[in-house]
């Protein structure tokens, strides 16, 4: 729970935040996600690092795996087998981009408390998993999948053409990882462990990015990504699935791309198990408007997968790209062939429809002007899901219980009015069979993360409530935070606003507009946060406002496809709109009024601050694209088009930061950027800086020397405190 | 007893127009898809069409959907099949059925009524 | 879908067991029904789901396949077995009916 005002007599015992409190994360908090292995048990890493095994129905836990045995290898992250015959430990982390890292990997056999001897596995490991069934492993190593029937045996290597920077199995390429897939991993195993399925990427024709990573020897290192920007060459992708149990027997088998695919490129998006004999592809045109989902059934005769035209179910836009940020996945039905999955109705808002003989004939199951986020489970009587419908706020999301095994299906909102005040933007986890699950509650209040009962609901018990944080909190002035909209030209503003502990509305004060703005991105919601903005407004007595302009996420199609194939228009225009709407609430000092933002959002302030209004006195950008030419073709391609004459390049030209430099004149900019920026190419912030120069338009800037996107370590203190300094004295507030 | 009474046969003329109906008691009617089902003299059994519980979704057999109209007043507890334009080979036994709603999201037919003779002659 | 069920006649004798087919021209992944008529009756629902029997069906009837291929066997025919048999799918409409089975009395 957010710590209640107190009364003036106290209020000197109250201390504003500090910029160190946000430096050393001394107001943040824990979650707790259960590790299931059953219907009715967990697994958690206690305070003391030992592996505990918690059985919900007895109440009792065992300790399976010591911080003796971890420590032993200085092992970071554990998994057991689904035979609980045996844990992996993984130590040497190793990160590479957003989610892949390699590792090495230690067995340990439970059933004698010893590490497995012989046949150990090669290192650093790319990616390793445990079959879903029994003991079984495999691995990728040197861009090659391996396979092991037990942890102790040789490996079968089930793939040969690996190749640094060139042919990847079983895990993807940069742009795959990044903006596609979303994981470190590019294999499945079926449910019971018979198949396993991966993809395999060939990049060969795709332009490299090549970088210098200075480090401490006399000569600098050149990084070289293949990574495809808008307009490039893609990789090429193909899906194989073999049989785990005679892996020599027939080899790896291609599932074949649907025709309407096929027929011009194309990408995969995503692969779900059904059955151990029947699997479920996505696939997405380039031009991503047309996304088709393909069932496929082994056929035992010709030990082939066959993918008939009849199980092909199309989905496409007609007024954007497929999907949201992604096509949804699908989530399937106890029948093993209809499944229910999240695209937009015929209202235009993101609903879940029941899919049996074909997508036309789609029962909906939920409507209404909100939308529905993620399925979490199925169960034979039960659909569990999120949405953001409870009293209209787009920025909470609630957990959601739908009987389907009778008619008419009944709604339940499980958490709506569980702890009100204090949780309104919720996630959850659910157990095998939807026997119990986790509810982990991220604020607006305080997170609390408490276990249900899966058939009543009921809370069991609390399994972390961040009593440290609350304690810690109790004497500490946070900043007052609203969430509200603004109506305008039928458009709805979402605005968070994070006002001064001590805010009086007659007096006038500094406004830092914190912005994103991406496309399908949300920044305004309701969950607990103790940062840099809080800071600001605690200490030094800004305001700050975030909104959600055109283009983001959850309030339906017309808001969320009205960027489309026009990034860097309306975002900037609502952001300034927004503005405009806080001044005329009358406590806004008009002279002193900022914006910066990360990433997209360091594009958006930056066309914010050369947009020619005169509203900004100055503003950061901190690793932003400049130009869409720079950016990653399946990201970019989604929302703009091609960078063609015959398609979208007019507007890839006019959204640049380049072309406005002139419109710098009149404001403070600050840019940022770090030199091994994998993901936004530093690049960007080059192209900036030579256009201000060739204008002679005077900035600061900063770069972070062999610092990737997400400028972390001491690059993240030094990062704050510039910003910090520069806001500061843009606002002229005293240090 | 669930039970379903269809009414409304007889003798039409060609080109002619007849409603059927189908009054269902001892169940919760307002829950349960309905269809109808058509079975010519010595022949086998035709599905016609379905409408679910609250007739946002009806379904028709191709052949007939231009000419036949199924409708149902769930205060009456009443099923419909408007007849229209009808032709020598409508002759038949037409047979109204309930279903049990079926996980997931499908329906059986349980309960059939003892059908009503429409005989098409000039 | 057309379903196409054979023998389209059958006779047996009490105690015999018979087996029914139903083919459909594509794949309706058991969303497949049984149904029982006897001489002047409304049809009555064996099976349903390729194999799950009906409330109050009598365990000698048995539904199963898979895919294209269904069959409905009636273990130790019953003198009260006799009747016109039905398949029918549930895939995606039209719901059709197969052609029918009259199993009579050798």
């Known amino acids: 729970l957010r710590p209640s005002r107190v009364h003036n007599s106290e209020e000197n015992t109250m201390r504003a935040l500090t910029l160190k409190d946000i430096l050393n994360g001394t107001f943040s908090y824990k979650t707790f996600f259960p590790n299931w292995i059953s219907g009715q048990e967990y697994l958690h890493q206690s305070a003391d690092n030992n592996i505990v095994l918690y059985n919900i129905e007895t109440g009792q836990s065992y300790t399976i795996l010591s911080n003796r045995t971890m420590k032993s290898v200085n092992a970071s992250n554990y998994g057991l087998s689904p035979d609980r015959q045996f844990v992996y430990l993984e130590s040497d982390y190793s990160k590479l981009w957003r989610y892949s890292y390699t590792a090495t990997y230690y067995i340990y056999d439970l059933s004698n408390g010893e590490f497995v001897r012989g046949n150990e596995l090669p290192r650093p490991i790319q990616y390793l998993c445990w079959s879903p069934v029994g003991s079984k492993l495999a691995y990728v190593y040197q861009n090659n999948i391996y396979l092991k029937q037990r942890p102790g045996d040789p490996p079968f290597q089930i793939t040969f053409n690996g190749r640094e920077n060139k042919i990847f199995n079983g895990i993807p390429d940069w742009v795959y990882e990044e903006e596609m897939l979303a994981t470190k991993y590019a294999l499945w195993w079926s449910p019971n462990g018979k198949f396993l399925a991966y993809a395999e990427f060939n990049d060969t024709d795709i332009p490299v990015i090549a970088y210098s990573y200075y480090g401490d020897e006399q000569y600098p290192r050149t990084i070289n990504i293949p990574y495809p920007k808008a307009g490039a060459k893609n990789p090429v992708v193909r899906i194989f699935i073999i049989d785990t149990t005679y892996p020599a027997y027939v080899g790896p088998q291609e599932v074949p791309v649907p025709a309407m695919i096929a027929s011009s490129d194309y990408y995969f998006s995503w692969l779900t198990w059904v059955t151990d004999e029947r699997v479920c592809l996505q696939w997405l045109k380039r031009v991503q408007n047309v996304s088709v989902l393909s069932i496929c059934d082994f056929r035992e005769d010709w030990q082939t997968w066959d993918c008939p035209k009849t199980q092909e179910h199309i989905e496409e836009s007609r007024t954007g790209w497929a999907g949201g940020f992604f096509v949804s996945t699908p989530v399937f039905s106890y029948d093993a062939i209809s499944y229910y999955k999240i695209f937009s109705d015929k209202d235009g808002y993101k609903h879940i429809h029941y899919i049996k003989d074909t997508v036309e004939n789609a029962i909906q199951i939920t409507s209404g002007k909100w939308e529905a986020i993620n399925i979490f489970r199925v169960t034979q009587d039960s659909l569990f899901y999120s949405s953001n419908e409870f009293e209209e706020y787009p920025g909470r999301r609630n957990i959601y219980r739908i009987s389907i095994g009778s008619y008419p299906p009944s709604k339940k909102c499980v958490t709506c009015h569980l702890r009100k005040e204090r949780c309104q933007y919720y996630t959850a986890s659910f157990s095998d069979y939807a026997k119990y699950y986790a509810l982990v509650c991220y604020g607006p209040g305080i997170p609390i993360s408490t276990l249900h009962d899966g058939r009543t609901d009921q809370e069991i018990k609390i399994l972390e409530e961040n009593k440290e944080l609350e304690n810690a909190l109790k004497n500490i002035q946070l900043p007052k935070e609203e969430i509200k909209k603004l109506e305008v030209d039928e458009i709805t503003l979402w605005y968070k606003m994070i006002l001064p502990p001590q805010f009086d509305r007659s007096k006038k004060y500094p406004l830092l507009i914190q912005v994103y703005g991406g496309p399908c991105s949300q920044s305004v919601r309701s969950v607990f946060a103790v940062n840099w903005i809080s800071y600001l407004a605690s200490k030094e007595g800004m305001v700050i406002a975030l909104v959600d302009g055109r283009g983001t996420a959850f309030q339906g199609d017309k808001l969320l496809y009205a960027v489309y194939r026009k990034l860097g228009v309306y975002e900037v225009e609502d952001q300034i709109t927004a503005v405009r709407k806080f001044i005329e609430m009358g406590f806004i000092d008009e002279k002193r009024i900022a914006i910066w933002g990360w990433s997209y959002g360091g594009y958006v302030s930056s066309l914010a601050l050369a947009s020619g209004t005169g509203l900004f006195k100055c503003g950061i950008a901190v690793a932003p694209v400049s130009s869409w030419e720079y950016y990653a073709s399946v990201y970019t391609e989604r929302f703009m088009g091609l960078p063609t004459k015959d398609d979208n390049l007019e507007h890839y030209k006019n959204s640049t930061v380049m072309a406005r430099a002139e419109y710098f004149r009149n404001v403070d900019y600050l840019l940022i950027h770090g030199t091994a920026d994998d993901n936004v190419h530093f690049q960007n912030s080059a192209q900036i800086a030579k256009a201000l120069v060739n204008a002679q338009v005077d900035f600061q800037a900063m770069w972070y020397s062999d610092q990737n996107h997400g400028l972390s370590g001491l690059s993240t203190n030094h990062l704050y405190t510039h910003m910090t300094h520069f806001l500061k004295q843009c606002f002229s507030l005293s240090d | 007893e669930v039970q379903l009474l269809e009414s409304g046969g007889g003798l039409v003329q060609p080109g002619g127009s007849l409603k059927l109906s189908c009054a269902a008691s001892g169940f919760d009617f307002s829950t349960y898809w309905m269809s109808w089902v058509r079975q010519a003299p010595g022949k086998g059994l035709e599905w016609i069409g379905e409408?679910?519980?609250?007739?946002?979704?009806?379904n028709y057999t191709p052949s007939l959907k231009d000419k036949f109209i199924i409708s149902r007043d769930n205060a009456k507890n009443t099923l419909y099949l408007q007849m229209n334009k009808v032709r020598s080979d409508d002759t038949a036994l037409y047979y109204c059925?309930?279903?049990?709603?079926?996980?997931?999201?499908?329906?059986?037919?349980?309960?059939w009524g003892q059908g009503t003779t429409v005989t098409v002659s000039s | 879908l057309v379903m196409t069920q054979s023998p389209s006649s059958l006779s047996a004798s009490v105690g015999e067991t018979v087996t029914i087919t139903c083919r459909a021209s594509g794949n309706i992944h058991n969303y497949l029904a049984w149904y029982q008529q006897k001489q002047g009756k409304s049809p009555q629902l064996l099976v349903y789901n390729a194999k799950t029997l009906a409330d109050g069906v009598p365990s000698r009837f048995s539904g199963s396949g898979s895919g294209t291929q269904y069959s409905l066997k009636i273990n130790s025919l019953q003198p009260e077995d006799f009747g016109s048999y039905y398949c029918q799918h549930f895939w995606s409409t039209p719901y059709t009916f197969g052609g029918g089975t009259k199993l009579e009395i050798k």
């Open positions: 059925a309930g279903g049990y709603y079926r996980y997931p999201y499908y329906y059986t037919m349980d309960y």
């Open positions: 409408i679910n519980p609250d007739s946002s979704t009806i």
